[in-house]
Interface confidence: medium
């Protein structure tokens, strides 16, 4: 069957996000992928969106992330814009209202996004074949 347009948008956003490091992509987030054996796909998407929302809510105006230079400022604002878009699209794909995120494990935002990109690409290859 056809791949969801939302899925294509997510992969596109993730490609943009993982291309460019910012001052805060090394900050840690909850690693929901560490022990996701008994988790449905929809729950994974929902929990990923929750983690991203927590991140940008905490760090949108974090001056450590905004940096000192004009370039750092705009890179961070672009990161936040992409994370919000990703959050919105993941919620749409998940179709769930809320989901618990209780894991103790942490990973950097950069690694989290790379892992999410791998999962999304796998999903895309399945639905496009």
């Amino acid at each position: 069957h056809k791949c969801d347009i939302t899925l294509q948008e997510i992969i596109k956003t993730l490609n943009s996000l993982t291309e460019q490091k910012t001052l805060c992509t090394e900050l840690t987030v909850t690693d929901i992928f560490a022990a996701s054996k008994n988790t449905t796909e929809k729950e994974t998407f929902c929990r990923a969106a929750t983690v991203l929302r927590q991140f940008y809510s905490h760090h949108e105006k974090d001056t450590r992330c905004l940096g000192a230079t004009a370039q750092q400022f705009h890179r961070h604002k672009q990161l936040i814009r992409f994370l919000k878009r990703l959050d919105r699209n993941l919620w749409g794909l998940a179709g769930l209202n809320s989901c618990p995120v209780k894991e103790a494990n942490q990973s950097t935002l950069e690694n989290f996004l790379e892992r999410l990109k791998t999962i999304m690409r796998e999903k895309y290859s399945k639905c496009s074949s």
Partner: nanobody, 116 residues
Amino acid sequence: EVQLLESGGGLVQPGGSLRLSCAASGFTFRNYGMAWVRQAPGKGLEWVSWIDASGTETYYADSVKGRFTISRDNSKNTLYLQMNSLRAEDTAVYYCAKSHGRFDYWGQGTLVTVSS
């Protein structure tokens, strides 16, 4: 043609105040975020403050937080920076910049000197 014209700079004593203005023309001012950026003598460019198109969301660099206030009047196509409790380290040329994914247009700048 985009034009940004800063004014209001000058010599002020430490602890004093200044209000910078930036008159914008050549683009639809109300549709764009705007910023103040400064360059101290012998230093690189440092962003100072940013405001969204509607004037509801603002950002400040740590170095000016609590002392500077950015605002805008979309009916007058003007951006402002109220600077209070000025310090010697605030001495710089202050530029207003149009913000569209990056600071894509700059004014000529206005010099602020804080000295006793």
